[in-house]
Interface confidence: medium
């Protein structure tokens, strides 16, 4: 991850130190302050690419407009998806909890993190950089960012271990309520999700930098002791590893078992009977990869450009300017990507779920209205209850309805 | 190759305005990180900065000639132009313009003035 | 401003002898430029962040320091670095240039 208007270039190189989720903009600048201003080689200063700033100049208005956006759609739209699971009964379910923590996760990201960033890339400085407030501020930042992105991804694995449940155990019966088991996973979620975050808040400091003979502030990651140094070095593998593989890993063995599961389980009279209720789960599992597959997509270029700098590019390297050009632009569009991943899940279930579609539709223009939600039980073999929407859309069996309330 | 020339009147009269260009090649001031700058030598004396001018627009002046000195630039035509108003016997000198490269380094930047003019000689006489 | 006071004004040295000059800034600074001027020659960049040759300076000549005082060395002295040598800092606003050392060969 600053002063007030010094220069347009002051502005880019506070950039340059951007947090964003889940990086921190390292191209032009190393990450940490070096202990002397000293160089590697001989002359090696003199070697320097000339459209870095350019790139970097471009880009702070882009995602000035994108930030804007994204804070209003992420806004809207998440706090709607919060207002319809809680507010209707029938949407209060395993999966829907689950749902929900991922939108209070991009929610707070979206109304805290990001005017900070567009106040930074506007002013040019960080907020506050001078009294106590920015100190805090530095820590808050970064820290609601890893712990953002990683209620997304730990939401994501959670959502995926509960669509095999679901199928594993087709014919166990619940109500309407969020599991005990789906709470417990919510509460660790977020709490493994700040305890990964920590080290965020304790690398990330106020640091004075000299620009154009004025001292400036601006909040970057600064390793102090050896943990940090460590953490600092392994931070792009450790970023890549847990926070984009974990989730595709987990989601791609969750849903392989899942698979398999289904095709064990193809023929009996079970299976025709639950005909609609597997048919239901089917598309609540294809709304839950509906989500992952857009996780993957908002995130890739972030970290392939992450880890090419981290493999790839060489500094001493002659020739590396073509290649930096490409990865800061690479860097770019996955950072305005990776923002957008905060805002874009609400209208993916918007598209995906035909319920949040109603009920966003409903919502948005008065109130997710309980009448299109008139439930009458029926009994079904004895071992689940049929809940029947008067939506002919709608036909919902045990957890379909209630565990599976998104389509 | 970068190359840096200074050219000016040669000889004026003091109260006079002053009015020299740098004509530079080698290298553009649309590029970022790059600046130009003027520094005077009186004759046998030290080095003096006067001012300076960066790709971006932002300008920079000594403070004890602020109201004197203005520093303007053509990307287009590459040249950098320095006037200094009201001058005086005290302002006769060599006066050389240089590139100035700005590099992030760390945190912190480094400035460096790497290719000079050869100078142009200023009088000031009555 | 930060006043940058060289010393000394005017040296001599002989063929091989190790020469330092010193440069002290009234303030902190981050780093220190230096700059060799022969007569009738504009400045060349000589030294930049403290301790970096510029290309084509010889190896012999080496910078070091921080804070307030910085030094210009030369471990053996040759005809050719006779000239008079500029610290300059950019820590703060404005630019300055040291008075100079001129260095001359005994």
């Known amino acids: 991850d600053n002063p007030e208007r010094y220069s347009t270039n002051l502005s880019n190189h506070v950039d340059d130190f951007t947090t964003f989720r889940g990086t921190e903009l390292s191209f032009l600048v190393t990450t940490h302050q070096p202990t002397n201003l000293v160089l590697p080689s001989n002359g090696s200063m003199h070697n320097y690419c000339p459209q870095q700033t350019k790139i970097t100049s471009a880009f702070k208005y882009i995602n000035t407009v994108i930030s804007c956006t994204i804070f209003i759609v992420g806004m809207v739209g998440n706090a709607t998806l919060l207002r319809i699971i809680y507010q209707n009964k029938c949407m209060r379910n395993g999966p829907n909890a689950l749902i929900a923590s991922l939108a209070l996760g991009d929610l707070i990201y979206v109304v805290i993190d990001l005017p900070i960033n567009v106040f930074k890339l506007l002013a040019g400085r960080w907020p506050f950089d001078h009294n106590d407030f920015g100190v805090f501020l530095c820590k808050l930042f970064p820290f609601l960012q890893k712990s953002s992105v990683g209620i997304t991804v730990l939401n994501l694995c959670a959502l995926s271990v509960d669509r095999y449940r679901a199928v594993a155990s087709w014919s166990r019966v619940q109500g309407i309520g969020i599991p005990l088991v789906t709470a417990i996973e919510i509460v660790s979620i977020w709490i493994l999700s700040f305890i990964l975050a920590i080290p965020e808040a304790i690398g990330f400091v106020m640091v004075p930098f000299e620009y154009r003979g004025e001292q400036h502030k601006t909040c970057m990651l600064n390793a102090t002791s050896k943990f940090m140094e460590f953490y600092q070095d392994v931070k792009d593998w450790w970023l890549f590893g847990f926070y984009f593989c974990m989730p595709l890993v987990c989601t791609a063995i969750f849903y392989t078992l899942m698979t398999c599961e289904m095709l064990n389980r193809r023929n009996g009279s079970l299976r025709i009977a639950l005909s609609e209720h597997l048919k239901q789960r089917r598309e609540v599992a294809k709304t839950v990869f509906c989500l992952v597959v857009i996780f993957a997509l908002c995130w890739f270029p972030l970290h392939l450009s992450r880890i090419l700098k981290k493999t790839v590019y060489n500094e001493m390297d002659k020739n590396r300017c073509e290649l930096l050009s490409f990865l800061l632009l690479m860097d770019y569009i996955g950072i305005n990507l990776a923002t957008m991943n905060s805002c874009i899940n609400p209208i993916a279930l918007y598209f995906v779920s035909k319920k949040f579609k109603n009920c966003f539709q409903s919502c948005l223009c008065c109130c997710c209205y309980q009448s299109k939600s008139l439930m009458t039980s029926v009994p079904m073999n004895g071992t689940s209850i049929q809940w029947k929407n008067h939506d002919q859309n709608n036909h919902n069996t045990d957890r379909s309805s209630h565990k599976d309330s998104m389509n | 190759q970068v190359t840096l020339k200074e050219s000016g009147p040669g000889i004026l009269k003091p109260s006079q305005t002053l009015s020299l260009t740098c004509s530079f090649s080698?290298?553009?001031?649309?590029?970022?990180?790059?600046?130009v700058g003027w520094i005077r030598q009186p004759s046998g004396k030290g080095l003096e900065w006067l001012a300076h001018?960066?790709?971006?627009?932002?300008?920079y002046y000594n403070p004890s000639l602020k109201r004197q000195i203005t520093i303007s630039k053509d990307s287009s035509r590459n040249q950098v132009f320095l006037k200094i108003t009201n001058v005086d016997t005290a302002d006769t000198a060599t006066y050389y313009c240089?590139?100035?490269?700005?590099?992030?380094?760390?945190?912190?930047?480094?400035?460096?003035?790497?290719?000079w003019g050869q100078g142009t000689s200023v009088t000031v006489s009555s | 401003q930060i006043v940058l006071t060289q010393s000394p004004a005017l040296m001599s040295a002989s063929p091989g002898e190790k020469v330092t000059m010193t440069c002290s800034a009234s303030s902190s600074v981050s780093y220190m430029c230096w700059y060799q001027q022969k007569p009738r020659s504009s400045p060349k960049p000589w030294i930049y962040?403290?301790?970096n040759l510029a290309s084509g300076v010889p190896a012999r000549f080496s910078g070091s320091g921080s804070g307030t005082s910085y030094s210009l060395t030369i471990s053996s002295m040759e005809a050719e670095d006779a000239a008079t040598y500029y610290c300059?800092?950019?820590?703060?606003?404005?630019?300055?240039f040291g008075a100079g050392t001129k260095l001359e060969l005994k």
């Open positions: 962040l403290t301790s």
């Open positions: 080698g290298f553009s001031l649309s590029t970022s990180g790059l600046g």
């Open positions: 300059q800092q950019w820590s703060s606003n404005p630019p300055t």
């Open positions: 240089a590139r100035r490269r700005e590099v992030n380094f760390g945190i912190n930047y480094y400035y460096s003035m790497d290719y």
């Open positions: 001018i960066w790709w971006d627009d932002d300008k």
